[in-house]
């Protein structure tokens, strides 16, 4: 970058090199170069001259003055005319950023993706803060009170082999960059109420033909967890408001749920689980399409409409449900 | 060589609109800084506007007589300078040169063109 | 802005005569001063930058000295030609100002 050039001189930031977004800051160039009284001292602001603003501090001293700077990043650079010579002398080059301390880390959340390993923890970070910003994960044993920390710019994937202090931990999060430090409330958790099921997937629809015909989606998981909540929402795609159906699964076979379409419209399905009278939900899974058929033949809607894995069991029994009808968006 | 050519005065009503034009050439015009300079009658020289070079992205500068009334822009494929005055006042009557600065004098100037605002 | 004092605000002088204009500025200018001539009903012509360098067809009767806040243009010996108005300029802080003019009459 800029700050790699040979200097004849330097060039410095006040209050600092990385500061608060929309202060007011100076930018001091000093040149220093043999044989020359600069006659003048010019800034340039990636790449382009400044031409306002400009002081001349003493004979080889200038400050360049910016209200309310607001660029994240910028590149800047001085030169000085001197006498005799044609063209302008570099002095120096400094990159300068802008951006906000952090705000302080909130929803905290901590789950263990069935098969995974891993306990994955996220935060909520607050506003963008443009500038670079860590964040140190805390996990305590509230068993053998040890402490552990794992530094991090984004979320934390941390072994569950790692977690040898029993299953209740304390997790918080700091934030920290050049402008300030922030902590997050604690969060209090035990391993096994953490734990989200392996993926529900749907693999399959087909409407059959009766005096009311009736749409099966197909649905499965991997998962090992006995008990275990799930919900189906679906709806036109021609409609914003979802109709929710709940679940208690048992997967040990492939699920199969009814439902009472109206005729030749598309329909989106999508299916999530957790373990029962837990706190996490798995995400929505990926849309499933269907479209009922007009009148009589038998429709059927197969996963290679996008990228899902058919489980192969035999079908089973018939999970029934209660409908509900529910607003969420995607 | 350099020449500069104003055109565009006249007599104009206070209130009313007046656009000037400098025609340019033998010089790199988007290496120059335009400005237009004023000289009321039997006074001295004052900066008005100026539009500076390519290197400084073409910033703008207006004195703070003529700020939000006149705008200055540069037409580089014409190599020409212009300078629209609105809500002219008679404080605004006076020779209007168009200058060429490469450093952040006044190196050439045109002959100038007279602007007279009077009811 | 940067303010220029130019004195003497008119002067008379004859043919011959070593003539000395001052211009003052309100802040250190670090030489970056202009000089300019003007006659009646032509636009101003470039004299003297830099302090004291000379623009390319200025004869070298014009010369300009100084550093600091203190400016002076000298005309060695008077012509005819000369009896016009001479103004400086600053041009070390942008935006570039003038004086108030010299105007340099027969006597």
């Known amino acids: 970058g800029i700050t790699n050039i040979n200097c004849s001189g330097h060039i410095w930031v006040e209050p600092a090199t990385i500061f608060k977004m929309g202060m007011n800051i100076s930018i001091y160039c000093q040149a220093a170069i043999k044989n020359c009284q600069p006659r003048k001292l010019h800034f340039y602001k990636n790449g382009i001259k400044e031409r306002f603003q400009i002081t001349r501090i003493n004979k080889t001293t200038a400050r360049l003055w910016y209200k309310n700077f607001l660029e994240p990043h910028a590149s800047m650079y001085c030169t000085a005319e001197c006498p005799k010579h044609f063209q302008e002398t570099l002095i120096c080059g400094k990159d300068i950023s802008s951006g906000y301390p952090p705000d302080i880390p909130d929803e905290v959340t901590c789950v263990i993706y069935e098969y995974s390993g891993n306990m994955t923890c996220t935060w909520n970070a607050g506003k963008l803060t443009y500038i670079d910003t860590k964040y140190v994960v805390h996990v305590k044993s509230l068993e053998t009170e040890e402490e552990q920390q794992y530094l991090t710019s984004s979320y934390i994937n941390i072994s569950t082999d790692s977690l040898q202090g029993g299953k209740k931990y304390l997790v918080w999060v700091q934030a920290a960059n050049a402008l300030g430090m922030e902590e997050s409330k604690q969060l209090q958790i035990h391993l096994d109420d953490i734990v989200i099921p392996s993926a529900a997937v749907i693999s399959r629809a087909e409407t059959i033909n009766a005096t009311v015909p009736k749409t099966i989606i197909y649905w499965d998981s991997q998962t090992t967890i006995e008990k275990v909540s799930c919900e189906m929402r679906y709806k036109a795609t021609t409609n914003q408001t979802w109709n929710v159906k709940e679940f208690d699964t048992n997967f040990t076979y492939v699920q199969q749920s009814e439902f009472y379409l109206e005729p030749n419209i598309k329909y989106v399905f999508q299916v999530r689980c957790q373990e029962t009278g837990k706190r996490y939900w798995q995400p929505w899974s990926s849309p499933f399409f269907h479209k009922t058929p007009e009148t009589v033949p038998q429709v059927t809607s197969k996963a290679f409409q996008h990228d899902t894995w058919n489980s192969g069991l035999t079908v089973a029994s018939i999970s029934t449900g209660h409908l509900t009808s529910d607003n969420r968006g995607d | 060589q350099v020449q500069l050519v104003e055109s565009g005065g006249g007599v104009v009503q206070p209130g009313r609109s007046l656009r000037l034009s400098c025609a340019a050439s033998g010089f790199d015009f988007d290496s120059y800084g335009m400005s237009w300079v004023r000289q009321a009658p039997g006074k001295g020289l004052d900066l008005v506007a100026d539009i500076n070079s390519k290197s400084y992205n073409y910033a703008t500068y207006y004195a703070d007589s003529v700020k939000d009334r006149f705008t200055i822009s540069r037409d580089n494929s014409k190599n020409t300078l212009y300078l629209q005055m609105n809500s002219l006042r008679a404080e605004d009557t006076a020779v209007y040169y168009c200058?060429?600065?490469?450093?952040?004098?006044?190196?050439?100037w045109g002959q100038g063109t007279l602007v007279t605002v009077s009811s | 802005d940067i303010q220029m004092t130019q004195s003497p605000s008119s002067l008379s002088a004859s043919v011959g005569d070593r003539v000395t204009i001052t211009c003052r500025a309100s802040q250190d200018i670090y030489t970056n001063l202009a000089w300019y001539q003007q006659k009646p009903g032509k636009a101003p012509k470039l004299l003297i930058y830099?302090?004291?360098s000379l623009q390319d067809g200025v004869p070298s009767r014009f010369s300009g000295s100084g550093s600091g806040t203190d400016y002076t243009l000298t005309i060695s010996s008077l012509q005819p030609e000369d009896f016009a108005t001479y103004y400086c300029l600053q041009d070390s802080e942008y935006p570039p100002t003038f004086g108030q003019g010299t105007k340099v009459e027969i006597k």
């Open positions: 830099h302090a004291s």
């Open positions: 200058a060429v600065h490469h450093s952040d004098y006044f190196e050439y």
